[in-house]
Interface confidence: low
């Protein structure tokens, strides 16, 4: 699986999850998030050669098409597969509010 | 929606579905598919600016991150959203077989 366990331990050029730390205030301008200050959102990148973690029949077909037609601009793209939530604390006036934001942390990638 | 109705009628630079005809024999080397000879598989391409058909909270965050940090390599990618099946005819010996292949035709795209 193209997950953090594999990708963070290997120098993988092809589609894999990459570490990306995002500081809410500095990187997003989100001053309203009280905690955490930031988090590892991670992201997916790298080429999708034929059959590499293909998501659908279409991505398999497109991967083969791209292999046989390397000048073509159509190819699968490395995108998130499994995501995890992140619990944040923010304030409405002086009242603390806790909310779980879904799909915030990329744990694995796929070729789609 | 970034679907064929919209994308095929507009000169859209950002993420959209693009027409792509694939000939089974010439483009894939699949000599076993008797009919159709080929089909419009289509594909997704184009930049994913902030908030453009964002698939998850993560893609929204990544889009904003990329807007505020344009030198960053991390950005959402334009990938298939809705796919349709394709019915094909092939032969096993002299016996014709009809099969529906799932997720073969891209109808719309999203930023993931």
């Amino acid at each position: 699986a193209l997950d953090t366990n594999y990708c963070f331990r290997n120098l993988e050029e092809n589609c894999c999850v990459r570490p990306l730390y995002i500081d809410f205030r500095q990187d997003l301008g989100w001053k309203w998030v009280h905690e955490p200050k930031g988090y590892y959102a991670n992201f997916c990148s790298g080429p999708c050669p034929y059959l590499r973690s293909a998501d659908t029949t279409h991505s398999t077909v497109l991967g083969l098409y791209n292999t046989l037609n390397p000048e073509a601009s159509a190819s699968p793209c490395c995108v998130p597969q499994d995501l995890e939530p992140l619990t944040i604390l923010y304030y409405v006036g002086r009242t603390p509010k806790v909310e779980q934001l879904s799909n915030m942390v990329v744990k694995s990638c796929k070729c789609s | 929606a970034l679907d064929t109705n919209y994308c095929f009628r507009n000169l859209e630079e950002n993420c959209c579905v693009r027409p792509l005809y694939i000939d089974f024999r010439q483009d894939l080397g699949w000599k076993w598919v008797h009919e159709p000879k080929g089909y419009y598989a289509n594909f997704c391409s184009g930049p994913c600016p902030y908030l453009r058909s964002a698939d998850t909270t993560h893609s929204t965050v990544l889009g904003l991150y990329n807007t505020l940090n344009p030198e960053a390599s991390a950005s959402p990618c334009c990938v298939p959203q809705d796919l349709e099946p394709l019915t094909i005819l092939y032969y096993v010996g002299r016996t014709p077989k009809v099969e529906q292949l799932s997720n073969m035709v891209v109808k719309s795209c999203k930023c993931s």
Partner: antibody
Framework: QVLLQQSGPELVKPGASVKISCKAS????????IHWVKQRPGKGLEWIGR????????NYTGKFKGKATLTADKSSSTAYMQLSSLTSEDSAVYFC?????????????WGQGTSVTVSS | SFVMTQTPKFLLVSAGDRVTITCKAS??????VAWYQQKPGQSPKLLIY???NRYTGVPDRFTGNGYGTDFTFTISTVQAEDLAVYFC?????????FGGGTKLEIK
């Protein structure tokens, strides 16, 4: 690899203060909270507070406000906790721990603990 | 602040047994609960985060479940090296309170 190295045991007199340290290595010190936890002999874990080394932001649990002061030095990647007006109730092992950096979800690395004994 | 009530306080089991520890939060913490193992003379070690996510390198005999206020931690087949105290902790809102702990002893 990630390591949190705490200072050695302390024997201090009642009424005095003590400052214990937690030196971090193997990760971006500024980007993750450092928590402090108290454990009295044979007892459970008690959360004291935490500090975000990036900007010095702190939070304390009520009973440790005024008792514990958390600071951090980014240049040496070291977090400190000062305990003041010590009494026998402050005799305990104190742990520093890093908030899990990949999901900010829990404390994934802990120091070895610093034993503080308050005795005259 | 949140109170985490952990039960039981003690567990005496044999190797091979299945054990379950429960933790009840005084109010909803969504799924922001972690479980730690502390062996005698050692620092606590993270086993489970976000209620059910096994931390890297943790054997799959350790599992966590729950949402809202009720959480469970299970060791499917206890081994001799599991002798330790186990703590739950809510990681939902400061102050991040711990449960009182469960001491697991092997017969």
């Amino acid at each position: 690899q990630v390591l949190l190295q705490q200072s050695g045991p302390e024997l201090v007199k009642p009424g005095a203060s003590v400052k214990i340290s937690c030196k971090a290595s193997g990760y971006a010190f500024s980007s993750s909270w450092i928590h402090w936890v108290k454990q009295r002999p044979g007892k459970g874990l008690e959360w004291i507070g935490r500090i975000y080394p990036g900007d010095g932001d702190t939070n304390y649990t009520g009973k440790f406000k005024g008792k514990a002061t958390l600071t951090a030095d980014k240049s040496s990647s070291t977090a400190y906790m000062q305990l003041s007006s010590l009494t026998s109730e402050d005799s305990a092992v104190y742990f520093c721990a890093r908030r899990m950096i990949t999901t900010q979800a829990a404390m994934d690395y802990w120091g070895q603990g610093t034993s503080v004994t308050v005795s005259s | 602040s949140f109170v985490m009530t952990q039960t039981p306080k003690f567990l005496l089991v044999s190797a091979g047994d299945r054990v379950t520890i429960t933790c009840k939060a005084s109010q909803s913490v969504i799924n922001a609960v972690a479980w730690y193992q502390q062996k005698p003379g050692q620092s606590p070690k993270l086993l489970i985060y976000y209620a059910s996510n096994r931390y890297t390198g943790v054997p799959d005999r350790f599992t966590g479940n729950g949402y809202g206020t009720d959480f469970t931690f299970t060791i499917s087949t206890v081994q001799a090296e599991d002798l330790a105290v186990y703590f739950c902790q809510q990681d939902y809102s400061s102050p991040y309170t711990f449960g009182g702990g469960t001491k697991l002893e092997i017969k």
